[in-house]
């Protein structure tokens, strides 16, 4: 999916008002310095691509983020403010229902959510030069 035509300001507002708080809640009890940011993005469409990938694609050691509150809200924001995104999710939703797993917070998941926090912060500062 190409995130170029999303309403970035409305997605940003949703992040600032609610998604960011859910990410912080998920990470509660973890030191902010515990994980190094290894995933980066260069512009808003690229950031959303990486955010989608880390949020919804199961990875080794962390298969359960998609049912978290921040993930549900991310999905809703993309469906509402990214043209044509919702139709890409119709088959994905059926597949996710079939493979629904128990939510488990592993160290790998905490690391992944820490990366997500970094990507979202970068999404909110699109004019900053990539370091």
């Amino acid at each position: 999916y190409d995130f170029t035509n999303c309403d970035f300001e409305k997605i940003k507002a949703a992040y600032l008002s609610t998604i960011s708080k859910d990410l912080i809640t998920y990470m509660s009890g973890t030191k902010s310095t515990e994980f190094n940011n290894t995933v980066s993005c260069s512009n808003r469409p690229h950031c959303l691509t990486e955010i989608q990938s880390l949020t919804f694609n199961p990875t080794a050691g962390c298969a359960s983020l998609a049912k978290e509150m921040f993930a549900m809200k991310t999905k809703a924001a993309l469906a509402i403010w990214c043209p044509g995104y919702s139709e890409t999710q119709i088959n994905a939703t059926q597949a996710m229902k079939k493979r629904r797993k128990r939510k488990v917070t592993t160290n790998k998941c905490l690391e992944q959510v820490s990366q997500l926090q970094g990507l979202w912060r970068r999404f909110n500062r699109p004019l900053l030069k990539q370091q």
Epitope: A79, E87, Q89, T93
Partner: antibody, heavy 120, light 107 residues
Amino acid sequence: QVQLVQSGDEVKKPGSSVKVSCKASGYIFTDYAMHWVRQRPGQGLEWMGTFIPLLDTSDYNQNFKGRATITADKSTSTAYMELSSLRSEDTAVYYCARMGVTHSYVMDAWGQGTSVTVSS
Amino acid sequence: EIVLTQSPGTLSLSPGERATLSCRASQPISISVHWYQQKPGEAPRLLIYFASQSISGIPDRFSGSGSGTDFTLTISRLESEDFAVYYCQQTFSLPYTFGTGTKVEIK
């Protein structure tokens, strides 16, 4: 079963406001956005805007921006649409309709409609 | 804003006949089109979503097709309860818009 029950019909004076309610039952309120659609007499359907309980935010058709306010009370699973500065051309039937925001993504259940007549 | 144009405006047919309704979008919208039926004094009822996906409880004589800018709703054999107004809707991007409507009337 899923039900959207709207408030009763209204007769209003030009320049006044109207607030229509839509009480939802039979599903998880925050899993769906609540949209508002109006239909003038003998005309087609016009999307006015939506409230997304999951994100606690609303979005509007520019044609209604500034005049329409869409809100919801999550504790009672009730959505509201207020339209101000009413004029005769706002005479219409107003519908609420739910739409999944993390699945389905379509207006699959509608309220029965609320008739609003604007007349001096 | 994406404009949806439906044709014909009115379709006069007899029960048992096949009805073909068209919906054309002003720009490509992939498969983000849904079809609704509306009878006088009633709210719209969802028939088909995402161009061709069927809804449980809707008779299988209703089917949808198309992608991009051209979409079709087909009623294979009209029953008396099918005479109504049909609207297409796009949810590709905000603001969501509806088509102009096609009235299917008894000939």
